[in-house]
């Protein structure tokens, strides 16, 4: 049980009559320390504290009465010096002074910790006039004190351009401990020590701290606030709080969860956003990060073709934005794709594998061994070629596109022919005699037109010339052939 020491403060006699006492609280304060008992004229020394002068400012009036007697110095009368009370209680305290009636318009202002208290404070000034002097009592009341009301209160009065200041009244609001620093949630490495801090203040002091981990007290004896707990390491999540105790009771901090960093969970929902012949754009939903930020992710790609050698391509990327374009893939191929992400602890397992396919692409190589010759009897140009390697067709051949350009004396015209995929030869009509015909062939799939072969040129003479020799695709690096017949 909490016991309260009480020392009653007796009001100081001011004047005859029913004047308010110098200490009025709507409860009995814990402890009141009056300065000295009895009415103290200015600069008189307290009998209980020899040699101690009144600390308030004193104004010595220059005005004299009709009989030319000098007026006594003006000073606030002593009042209670220290009021201790519990939070949410009410308190009332006052300053009093006797002012000769020759002074008009005397006002008393209240100050706290050096700042004037203005506005919504419960300050009341009462005047009790007599023949020669007026007793002025300024009361200050707080209905429900808070910690912010702690401080030093004084009264000030201006007379004759002199300022009279009362002794301070110290208000000390006591309550349960108040946390100024509480433990914070953290993510920590398994079996690694870390610190938690807890700090609480009164009044009343001292404030003692107990640490609690998973509802068990860590320290069986209190530690003075502030307290730092070194946790020797955790193997699993734990909840910590601290208890702050003072003579008024106990306050418990918020409970904070300390998590153990772990490898992340595998990503989920890997999905195909877009496919082209040579790339696949994937996205994924990251798994749980294991209480440690993701650093990067790894996309694993393997050919789904059972005849493939099973090698895995790995593409590393940043953890954000959970999107990656896998490039350098073969067209019209099936792939298995998995995603794994890492944090500071390590790599997650791979996500569930998904199947994805690239689309058909335009062939990546041109037809090979293109040869061209003139069939004069039918006035046609015969063209032959070999189809590109299957691997490089990047799809199913639907045919070929033949470009033939006819050039003669300043005239040039290009014509395009489409031929089906079955043959590897074509015949085109001679368009212009006495001209050069340049032929290029490209393979075509549903994915588009591939690159054209290197140009093969043949000269078409005027009628009556005979052509037996074909023109063909040159070996790489040779100049374009021109066959003159």
């Amino acid at each position: 049980a909490i016991t309260e020491a009480r020392e009653e403060a007796k009001p100081y006699p001011l004047f005859p009559g029913p004047f308010p006492g110098s200490l009025q609280t709507d409860h009995t304060p814990l402890l009141s320390l009056p300065h000295a008992s009895g009415y103290q004229p200015a600069l008189m020394f307290s009998p209980t504290q020899p040699g101690r002068p009144h600390t308030g400012n004193v104004a010595i009036p220059q005005v004299t009465s009709v009989e030319s007697k000098p007026l006594p110095p003006l000073a606030f009368k002593h009042t209670v010096g220290h009021i201790i009370l519990s939070e949410h209680k009410g308190v009332k305290f006052n300053c009093s002074i006797s002012v000769p009636n020759i002074y008009q318009d005397t006002t008393i202002s209240w100050w706290k910790d050096g700042k004037e208290l203005l506005g919504a404070h419960h300050a009341i000034t009462q005047f009790y006039p007599d023949d020669e002097v007026t007793a002025i009592i300024a009361s200050f009341s707080i209905t429900s004190v808070q910690r912010s009301d702690n401080g030093s209160y004084i009264c000030k009065m201006k007379i004759n351009n002199e300022e009279i200041v009362s002794d301070p009244i110290y208000i000390e609001v006591q309550g349960l401990p108040h946390f100024t620093k509480q433990p914070e949630s953290m993510n920590v490495t398994r079996n690694t020590a870390f610190n938690l801090t807890c700090q609480a203040v009164g009044p009343p002091e001292p404030v003692n701290i107990f640490w609690v981990q998973n509802s068990s007290r860590v320290n069986e004896q209190p530690e003075k606030s502030p307290s730092v707990l070194t946790v020797p390491g955790l193997t699993e999540m734990a909840v910590f709080s601290c208890e702050a105790h003072n003579d008024k009771g106990l306050t418990v901090s918020k409970g904070v969860q300390i998590n153990i960093k772990a490898i992340p969970s595998p990503p989920t929902e890997v999905s195909i956003r877009n496919s082209t012949a040579h790339s696949i754009l994937i996205s994924w939903v990251p798994g749980f990060d294991g209480y440690s930020p993701f650093r990067n992710c790894s996309i694993q790609v393997k050919e789904a073709d059972p005849l493939s050698n099973g090698s895995v391509m790995i593409f590393n990327t940043s953890a954000l934005p959970h999107l990656y374009q896998i490039k350098q893939l073969q067209a019209l191929a099936n792939y298995s794709i998995g995603v794994s992400c890492m944090n500071e602890i390590g790599w997650s397992a791979v996500s569930p594998w998904i199947l994805a396919s690239t689309t058909e692409g335009a062939p990546s190589v041109a037809p090979l061994n293109v040869t061209v010759f003139l069939n004069e009897s039918s006035d046609n140009v015969d063209i032959r070629w070999m189809k590109p390697p299957t691997k490089q067709q990047d799809g199913e051949l639907v045919g070929y596109r033949i470009s033939h350009v006819w050039q003669s004396a300043g005239i040039s015209k290009e014509l395009l022919e489409e031929v089906g995929q079955n043959g590897s030869r074509a015949r085109i009509s001679v368009q212009v005699h006495n001209a050069t015909c340049t032929v290029r062939i490209a393979a075509v799939t549903r994915g588009g037109v591939g690159p054209f072969s290197d140009p093969v040129k043949i000269f078409i003479p005027a009628h009556g010339w005979v052509d037996y020799a074909p023109s063909s695709t040159p070996a790489p690096g040779n100049a374009d052939p021109v066959l003159i017949i």
Epitope: N191, N214, S216, E220, Q221, P222, P232, T235
Partner: antibody, heavy 118, light 106 residues
Framework: QVQLVQSGSELKKPGASVKISCKAS????????MNWVRQAPGQGLEWMGW????????TYADDFKGRFVFSLDTSVSTAYLQINNLKAEDTAVYFC???????????WGQGTLVTVSS | EIVLTQSPDFQSVTPKEKVTITCRAS?????MHWYQQKPDQSPKPWIK???NLASGVPSRFSGSGSGTDFTLTINSLEAEDAATYYC?????????FGQGTKLEIK
């Protein structure tokens, strides 16, 4: 450095009482609780309980409630264990040990042998 | 109360051998402490809070575990390691010790 020095061996008759002491030095006595641990001959360690050196409040393990009394004299930084109505099975070495965070017994006294024999 | 069961009770080991002592709790505990005791001496603090070696303890010792299963391991036994080792739990009152494991050097 931290030291816990216990009083010397005791030979007692059944029914008698014994009070053994544990004097602490090298740290603030009231900062750490004091545990008492019993070790019967050839046996393991048994936690008897502890005393809060800040408040003086004792806590006894179930097997040590009744005849066992923990006390303090903080002015001389000393904890005491008194055993009343001694029985033969109380024959053991009694250790004091400081009570740190997480009930870590960081410092131990050298032990006091109490022999109960008629 | 939580019962701690150490195994083995006794082990005779040759120097340089690896030794593992286990301590199993009847319910989950937060931390396990270990103490070393030699004949006619008081116990010495050895491993704090499952895995933290006390001051002066050789690095050949290590501690691990969580929940109900904890181990003290000596990587390469030396003659001076002959002693009885006790585990002690923190997390549930009353505090309890294991029955001890006595290591003897062959």
């Amino acid at each position: 450095q931290v030291q816990l020095v216990q009083s010397g061996s005791e030979l007692k008759k059944p029914g008698a009482s014994v009070k053994i002491s544990c004097k602490a030095s090298g740290y603030t006595f009231t900062n750490y609780g004091m545990n008492w641990v019993r070790q019967a001959p050839g046996q393991g360690l048994e936690w008897m309980g502890w005393i809060n050196t800040y408040t003086g409040e004792p806590t006894y393990a179930d097997d040590f409630k009744g005849r066992f009394v923990f006390s303090l004299d903080t002015s001389v930084s000393t904890a005491y264990l008194q055993i009343n109505n001694l029985k033969a099975e109380d024959t053991a070495v009694y250790f004091c040990a400081t009570y740190g965070h997480y009930a870590w017994f960081a410092y131990w006294g050298q032990g006091t042998l109490v022999t109960v024999s008629s | 109360e939580i019962v701690l069961t150490q195994s083995p009770d006794f082990q005779s080991v040759t120097p340089k051998e690896k030794v593992t002592i286990t301590c199993r709790a009847s319910s989950s505990v937060s931390y396990m402490h270990w103490y070393q005791q030699k004949p006619d001496q008081s116990p010495k603090p050895w491993i704090k809070a499952t895995s933290n070696l006390a001051s002066g303890v050789p690095s050949r010792f290590s501690g691990s575990g969580s929940g109900t299963d904890f181990t003290l391991t000596i990587n390469s036994l030396e003659a001076e390691d002959a002693a009885t080792y006790y585990c002690q739990q923190w997390g549930t009152k009353p505090l309890t010790f294991g029955q001890g494991t006595k290591l003897e050097i062959k």
